[in-house]
Interface confidence: medium
């Protein structure tokens, strides 16, 4: 079976002038997934990103996350890129607090 992930991009204050943007993928199966941040369409160097392990979420599906710190005001330059079960999608940083996008394949 294949269950596409719910992708949830959030932002939080990190330090003055900076914010942390976190991209969470949840409720997906199988557990194999790729999640990474891009700036202006180009993948960020992985040493500027932090990943969570892929963990079961208790419903027979999985969850994980990737986060990076960016300059406040540059949110529109960043997107979260996701690959799962041969499909891919990109997800922008929300202008508000939370944006939830369901992938439809």
């Amino acid at each position: 079976r294949r269950v596409p992930p719910m992708v949830n991009v959030t932002r939080s204050e990190a330090s003055e002038g900076n914010i942390t943007v976190t991209c969470r993928a949840s409720s997906f199966y199988p557990r194999n997934i790729t999640l990474t941040w891009r700036q202006d369409g180009v993948s960020l160097s992985h040493d500027t990103q932090q990943w969570g392990d892929v963990l079961p979420d208790g419903n027979g599906t999985y969850q994980t996350w990737v986060a990076t710190r960016i300059c406040q005001g540059e949110e529109q330059r960043f997107t979260c890129y996701m690959e799962h079960s041969g499909n891919h999608s990109t997800h922008p940083v929300p202008s508000g607090k939370v944006l939830v996008l369901q992938s439809h394949w």
């Epitope: 199988p30 194999n32 992985h46 892929v54 690959e83 041969g86 891919h88």
Partner: antibody, heavy 119, light 108 residues
């Protein structure tokens, strides 16, 4: 059956460019990313860069100024071009499939292209 | 960049022996992004163990992997002749994504 077949020159003159083509079969480049890795006696295995399913590229910072990776999905071909080769670029160059969710592990390797940089 | 140090460089083992090789990272690596490859002379490397402890397709169950943080290992519980090869650890945690220098496992 997954295969990655490489073609390219065995001998490159110093300061010249290297071009290698990787032709894949048994999978689609719209579904899998491809890495390039090289192996040399002096430096061992080195990751050069990769191209994602959507065509975005990641490069090793040590090579970013002289390396480009491109692909043609319709022809199932991935291309590596490296400029300004020197003797220490001698080695075996591999194209490698990025495994699905194997956390960027490399699950199928090409046969390798042996490259000697010499005049 | 993260330096991966493999030890020993050469490991000699008798058939049937249990052997362990190690991979030490210069800074912490997520266990999800630590992999092992097997390479035999004249051949391309093969994915052997992914994400620290998961055996790739076709890898015999006598192989196992473990570890976390900066210390990882690959173990062969019952050495067989076909296991003679060089094993490389690889991290995809931080760019540039690096490989260890390899442990050559040979038959004593």
């Amino acid at each position: 059956q997954v295969q990655l077949k490489q073609s390219g020159p065995g001998l490159v003159q110093p300061s010249q460019s290297l071009s290698i083509t990787c032709i894949v079969s048994g999978f689609s480049l719209t579904t899998y990313g491809v890495h390039w890795v090289r192996q040399s006696p002096g430096k061992g295995l080195e990751w050069l860069g990769m191209i994602w399913t959507d065509g975005t590229t990641d490069y090793n910072a040590a090579f970013i100024s002289r390396l480009s990776i491109n692909k043609d999905n319709s022809k199932s071909q991935v291309f590596l071009k490296m400029n300004s080769l020197q003797a220490d670029d001698t080695g075996i160059y591999y194209c490698v499939r990025k495994g699905h969710g194997y956390y960027y592990a490399m699950d199928y390797w090409g046969q390798g292209t042996s490259v000697t940089v010499s005049s | 960049q993260i330096l991966l140090t493999q030890s020993p460089a050469i490991l000699s083992a008798s058939l049937g022996e249990r052997v362990t090789m190690t991979c030490t990272a210069s800074s912490s690596v997520s266990s999800s992004y630590l992999h092992w490859y097997q390479q035999k002379p004249g051949s391309s490397p093969k994915l052997w163990i992914y994400s620290t402890s998961n055996l790739a397709s076709g890898v015999p169950a006598r192989f196992s992997g473990g570890g976390s943080g900066t210390s990882y290992s690959l173990t062969v519980s019952n050495m067989e002749a076909e296991d003679a090869a060089t094993y490389y650890c690889h991290q995809y945690h931080r760019s540039p994504f690096t490989f260890g220098s390899g442990t050559k496992l040979e038959i004593k």
